[in-house]
């Protein structure tokens, strides 16, 4: 597996990556062009200067490379038969490797689609699950809470493991695990609701392994704009998977005449994807794309990683901003369909709902909008960032900040428009969500820039934990609580049902504005933190010649 500089040209040529690589080589005092296109530790197939697989020594904290005997003690930078031939020898850039990395990113993205497809298939048949098991609303809330809590708790654990052990094995095991659990859960008898709760908790653990580790592999396969693009594809999987989950849930239920079959689709696809990950995703070294040769030193302790992340201001502020996004999406996703239904009751275009599901049509429209705006947001965000990077080095956090602040305006306008026009409200939702979702991939990219490769899985995990804890774990309940509080002090009428929920939801744009402020704060520290991370990577790299085995 060759690093980005070798393969990106084959995949369409990335001049800026080459220039960036050249700059870094000069910083390390390497001769320009030495070793041809200085690539990262590839597993060779024998041959001069290429390290074969058996020359790699696995340790608990990573792997070190034995220098093949009979070779000069040069940094084992693959590509490296070329180094033996001399600097003038042009290095061929095999297209297959570019395709291989593209395929790896595609499979990882497919895995993410399945992650969310599985999660939202359950949402798609939740009413059937509630009906079958006799689950009350508090029970449905328990299912969601158990999932989020187990996900939150498991994420830092997998972050720790992901920075220290074989990531693709952890990924595949995670997929196999949640697939098996979801499949088994389709056979749970009616009297064992607690087993269903347990299964959702276990699925949360399985999915946490994927969500925390997969982005770091993409981060190690690509850099700069290519990485932004690939992360965009990876994060587009969220709305795509969510939308497909709803569709799969309802359509499989209708086709089979039994909701149980809906829970048997994603596990089968999951098993296939897990196998493909094992076969096709390369066992990339941490910092593969960033470091250009050499070998990263042994991993630091988890406590030291946490201290470093907490001191990393760009990381902290972007994580808080992500929490704000999570808060808003969690609350809006839960309450907007009901809010719009109540708006129609007030406008006398719909009847008061006494028997749930209330606002089913609005849920469907909102789901479709979320799915499409997720795609549009990711594309818009990535495109805007690429364009802005030509003008400022702080493009990433600034694009996020603008997106958040713009989103807050349109979220506010939802509540203005809903009083008179449902179509107007939907337009505001469309624009607001597009802007809100525009920072998904960019936030991940910011993390890749400011966190060193050996800490990335822990960083993703901690960010995931924080965004759930401060975001969607509590926001739906908080909005409901505020709405009930307002209603207690007003007269019981459809108008006040509508207004109280609207006033409660007004908390969302304020939180989004706060998130925008956090992104602006990220912009202040972004360049210094990025430089620090690059400097740390350079310090972490040591030539394998000096490694005592």
């Amino acid at each position: 597996m060759m690093c980005l500089e070798c393969a990106s040209a084959a995949a369409g040529g990335a001049e800026e990556e080459e220039a960036d690589a050249e700059r870094r080589r000069r910083r390390r005092g390497a001769q320009p062009g030495a070793g041809g296109s200085a690539c990262c530790g590839a597993r060779g197939v024998g041959g001069a200067g290429v390290v074969s697989a058996d020359e790699e020594v696995q340790t608990l904290s990573g792997s070190v490379r034995r220098v093949p005997s009979g070779l000069p003690s040069i940094p084992s930078t693959p590509g490296c038969a070329a180094a033996a031939k001399g600097p003038s020898a042009p290095q061929p850039k095999p297209a297959s490797l570019g395709r291989g990395r593209g395929a790896a990113a595609a499979i990882l993205s497919l895995g993410n689609v399945l992650n969310y497809l599985d999660r939202y298939t359950v949402a798609g048949v939740l009413l059937d699950i509630q009906q079958h098991f006799g689950v009350k609303d508090r029970g449905a809330g328990l299912l969601q809470s158990v999932f989020i809590c187990s996900f939150m708790v498991a994420a830092p654990i997998f972050g720790y493991l992901g920075d220290r052990f074989n990531r693709k094995v952890i990924l595949s095991c995670g997929i196999f695990f949640w697939s098996a659990v979801t499949f088994s859960s389709s056979f749970i008898p009616q009297q064992y609701f607690w087993l269903l709760v347990l299964s959702r908790g276990l699925v949360g653990i399985g999915e946490a392994s994927y969500s925390t580790i997969a982005p770091t592999i993409i981060g190690d396969l690509f850099t700069k704009n290519t990485r932004t693009l690939m992360l965009s594809v990876f994060y587009f999987a969220i709305p795509l998977g969510s939308g497909l989950g709803y569709i799969t849930g309802s359509s499989v239920k209708q086709a089979a005449g039994d909701w149980h079959w809906a829970l048997r689709v994603s596990p089968v696809l999951g098993m296939i994807t897990g196998t493909l990950i094992l076969i096709l995703v390369p066992a990339t070294k941490r910092g593969h794309a960033d470091q250009l040769g050499g070998q990263l030193k042994a991993r630091t302790s988890w406590l030291r990683d946490m201290k470093a992340l907490i001191r990393n201001r760009s990381y902290v502020f972007s994580s808080l901003a992500t929490s704000a996004v999570s808060f808003a999406t969690g609350a809006l996703g839960m309450w907007i369909p009901l809010y719009l239904h109540r708006a129609q009751v007030v406008q006398k275009t719909a009847e008061t709902c006494n028997s749930p599901p209330c606002g089913a049509k609005d849920s469907l429209i909102f789901g479709a909008i979320t799915c499409f705006t997720g795609f549009l947001g990711v594309v818009t965000g990535a495109g805007a960032t690429r364009w802005c990077r030509l003008r400022t080095q702080r493009a990433d956090p600034l694009v996020c900040a603008v997106g958040m602040l713009g989103s807050a305006i349109f979220i506010c306008l939802i509540f203005v428009a809903a009083k008179t026009s449902i179509v107007g409200a939907y337009i505001c939702i469309f624009v607001g969500e597009t802007l809100l979702f525009s920072n998904w991939a960019i936030t991940a990219d910011i993390l890749m820039y400011v966190v060193i490769p050996t800490r990335r899985a822990t960083a993703v995990a901690l960010q995931s934990f924080t965004s759930h804890l401060l975001g969607d774990a509590g926001s739906p309940y908080l909005i409901g609580f505020i709405s009930d509080l307002i209603r207690q002090s007003t007269k019981d009428s459809p108008l006040w049902e509508f207004l109280s929920l609207g006033y409660a939801l007004m908390l969302c744009p304020f939180v989004v504005v706060l998130g925008g402020m956090f992104f602006l704060a990220t912009a202040l520290f972004f360049l210094s933190d990025r430089a620090k991370a690059e400097q740390q990577v350079n310090q972490l790299v040591m030539p394998p010649a000096s490694v005592k085995v």
Partner: antibody, heavy 125, light 107 residues
Framework: EVQLVETGGGLVRPGSSLKLSCATS????????MSWVRQAPGKGLEWVAL??????????NYAESIKGRFTISRDDSKSRVYLQMNTLRDQDTATYYC????????????????WGQGVMVTVSS | DIVLTQSPPTLSVTPGESVSLSCRAS??????IHWYQQRSNESPRLLIK???QSIAGIPSRFSGSGSGTDFILSINRVESEDFSVYYC?????????FGPGTKLEVK
Amino acid sequence: EVQLVETGGGLVRPGSSLKLSCATSGFTFSDTWMSWVRQAPGKGLEWVALIKDKNSNSEANYAESIKGRFTISRDDSKSRVYLQMNTLRDQDTATYYCTRHEDFYYYSGYYFDYWGQGVMVTVSS
Amino acid sequence: DIVLTQSPPTLSVTPGESVSLSCRASQGISTSIHWYQQRSNESPRLLIKYASQSIAGIPSRFSGSGSGTDFILSINRVESEDFSVYYCQQTYSLPLTFGPGTKLEVK
């Protein structure tokens, strides 16, 4: 001790209305799902209607044979469940039982763990 | 709707004998079956829930088994108070349905 007491039965003409009431005691009514089950003379049991608790938005479910004619409702403050029967037919003649579903806080069983003594409704011209 | 068939409609036994009452569902319903006893001029009472789970206060001679479509209610050494009608009920899906009943009578 759990108690379910039905009242409101009697003899009515086809097409007329009747409201059955079930007074409950000995358990937390507001958290419990309640149903009406009927039994025509010399025949088997037939489920009529179910009303869930407020934590399930007091959702109601009905048997196809009575849908649109009967309405189940509850009053948590009085611990009572009702069955409003409109457009009554001859085939609605039966003993109507008020039943309780076993409750497990987060979920409820669909089976009936307690039954009232029943109330007779006769529809005849 | 899920249809339940009980057999035999009537079962004549002598006290002290052991019997098995059958209930068959029109489709697979896992273990979502429940058994009730209705003595003459009385309200029904729950005997067994979820195919095999016993109920507090119900004599241990009553037991249930089965899964999928075929279910059995067994009465070990029938006593005089057991002569009544037995109904099975499914809760796998709405509408909730009952079997037509099996009448246990003295031989």
